[in-house]
Amino acid sequence: AADPLLGGQGPAKECEKDQFQCRNERCIPSVWRCDEDDDCLDHSDEDDCPKKTCADSDFTCDNGHCIHERWKCDGEEECPDGSDESEATCTLGTCHGNEFQCGDGTCVLAIKRCNQEQDCPDGSDEAGCLQVPPTFLGNRRRPRGLNECLHNNGGCSHICTDLKIGFECTCPAGFQLLDQKTCGDIDECKDPDACSQICVNYKGYFKCECYPGYEMDLLTKNCKAAAGKSPSLIFTNRHEVRRIDLVKRNYSRLIPMLKNVVALDMEVATNRIYWCDLSYRKIYSAYMDKASDPKEQEVLIDEQLHSPEGLAVDWVHKHIYWTDSGNKTISVATVDGGRRCTLFSRNLSEPRAIAVDPLQGFMYWSDWGNQAKIEKSGLNGVDRQTLVSDNIEWPNGITLDLLSQRLYWVDSKLHQLSSIDFSGGNRKMLISSTDFLSHPFGIAVFEDKVFWTDLENEAIFSANRLNGLEISILAENLNNPHDIVIFHELKQPRAADACKLSVQPNGGCEYLCLPAPQISSHSPKYTCACPDTMWLGPDMKRCYRDGNEDSKMGST
């Protein structure tokens, strides 16, 4: 189940039909009932659950829950009802797998058996022991028939297995040998792909959970969008923008009669689509339901624009960002195009795709020039850094998975689809294929899938985003499919606009208020910026024509 603090509703109200009412009057999704998580925070969602048949290696709690047998009587209550530590369970009960049961019913660690010290009150731990020095794993010079496991459990913390020659220490499921003798918990969650979204490590096992808005698919164990409209995939083929419903798989034309559209993006909350036309040298916007009408296509940018090949919408702060491979710049503007400024005009060779993370205040872009790379910076243009610069040639499309905090990209020269975390670590090459990645261009991620367009195959493909498997064709015979985006409310989570939270309108900025990257708790929330012909004044808010000031960017 998801975080109960996020899942719970206020008290003293009736729950929805698909919700469960806790004793404390919280409402939780019905599917969280009897999932072995205390989502109600009073255990009421885990009471009166149907009795489960527990595995042989498990202990069955009085309320039907299953826990590992070895957790019984270990001093910690793992059963929600505490029955694993009850007097009835622990008095003269059976001991754990790593324990020895004394004659009086008490338990001592198995390694204390036959250690020539009396550990059981009745001394039964030293009864029937061979008086020989201890042997170790792989000791081949021992008397034939000697069972080292009888002495001190062979030094094993858990399971000792006697072999023809020597012995072997092993561990129960969910544990691993740390030093050939001692078992420690395996942290399955260290593998970023252990779960499709949230991984929670427990003693001896782990559990996958989903973020709010998603629910676990019981068959695949992947997280799927729980509510809202069905997700759709929107792409451009230069002359049109088309849409594919990912559930119904129906296909429609959103915008016809385009000249040369390569880049597009969406703003889900307002139902607007944004696109760049390289022939008209304009950036447009329209409501999705009116986008096919040329009268309703608003022009946001139609000046100082050469080759806008990448476009991204910051849905939180209401800005658009674009790359211009002709001007060799990266720029930002308000979503109505009214205020704009150039963020980067140096050290750009062939900037192409751009993606934004408004929640953390970062943007990412690809450059397929001679020194191909993927870079990142704050949404205000500060803290520029290179994320990927080796084993990269023609990075066309990039996309962000905000939930897993990973960036995915396609390289059309190396025929690869790769991912990396937002700080540039844990790089993974998911797919390398001249067939499926013949000339990839656009890329998008949603749920457990990654989608990409391929110009040579004239198709849209999908694959599992964690391992690159399950490659399939979503649509073919598309004729030049370029940029691609997923349209769904979960792709653009809501967040506070720092510039609006400020006491002064627009953060006190005269012109543009841009979000600053959230690197630490001390990071400024935003900085002010000025048009290209002006400079930020000493107050870091107002703009001046006099070019004496040091910088066009300042922090607040």
Epitope: P294, K295, Q297, E298, V299, L300, I301, D302, G337
Partner: antibody, heavy 117, light 107 residues
Framework: EVQLVESGGGLVQPGRSMKLSCAAS????????MAWVRQAPTKGLEWVAT????????YYRDSVKGRFTISRDNAKNTLYLQMNSLRSEDTATYYC??????????WGQGTLVTVSS | DIQMTQSPPSLSASLGETVSIECLAS??????LAWYQQKPGKSPQLLIY???SLEDGVPSRFSGSGSGTQYSLKISNMQPEDEGVYHC?????????FGAGTKLELK
């Protein structure tokens, strides 16, 4: 409702100047390129000039280049056409237009400019 | 500039009749063609865009067709309110250019 209202037309002598205005309402003025199209009496339509959304780019038909200046004031939602060195062949009804992609979407009612001595 | 040749310059039709107006572009305009109707003393109104897309509120008796350089406007079931001048316009390249117009009268 989109409304475009032209003003400033009238009788003017050849070689003199005249400025046309167009007051726009009912839409986000700064989000659309604006144009002037003219129609000489009993003749066809003729595109004259277009201005980009922020006024930074202007486009003219060859016969008016250097004589006419199209401009806009987004704060006032107003489009202008400054016409200098007027000629008799400039006599026409001038229409203020909100452009759409590849077409002339909305037209004003027009203002007549007569160039005559 | 792209030249637009419209024909015929004028025509008259009886009530209920079907009429066609042709427009020929000097080069391929890839369906970037609009038709406008101008009633006497009024400003032109958009009828059809992208060669065959009917503007909202325009009666379905109006239809557009064509591709490449040749386009036509068809008015089936001629009505008295259809009288006026019809203009074609290419939007493929700047400068956008118009045909000379076709005057349609009711017989």
């Amino acid at each position: 409702e989109v409304q475009l209202v032209e003003s400033g037309g009238g009788l003017v002598q050849p070689g003199r100047s005249m400025k046309l205005s167009c007051a726009a309402s009912g839409f986000t003025f700064s989000s659309f390129p604006m144009a002037w199209v003219r129609q000489a009496p009993t003749k066809g339509l003729e595109w004259v000039a277009t201005v980009s959304t922020r006024g930074g780019h202007t486009y003219y038909r060859d016969s008016v280049k250097g004589r006419f200046t199209i401009s806009r004031d987004n704060a006032k939602n107003t489009l202008y056409l400054q016409m200098n060195s007027l000629r008799s062949e400039d006599t026409a009804t001038y229409y203020c237009i909100r452009e759409g992609t590849s077409l002339f979407a909305y037209w004003g009612q027009g203002t007549l400019v007569t160039v005559s001595s | 500039d792209i030249q637009m040749t419209q024909s015929p310059p004028s025509l008259s039709a009886s009530l209920g009749e079907t009429v066609s107006i042709e427009c020929l572009a000097s080069e391929d305009i890839s369906n970037y063609l609009a038709w406008y109707q101008q009633k006497p003393g009024k400003s032109p109104q958009l009828l059809i865009y992208y060669a065959n897309s009917l503007e909202d509120g325009v009666p379905s008796r109006f239809s557009g067709s064509g591709s490449g350089t040749q386009y036509s406007l068809k008015i089936s079931n001629m009505q008295p309110e259809d009288e006026g001048v019809y203009h074609c316009q290419q939007g493929y390249n700047y400068p956008y250019t118009f045909g000379a117009g076709t005057k349609l009268e009711l017989k």
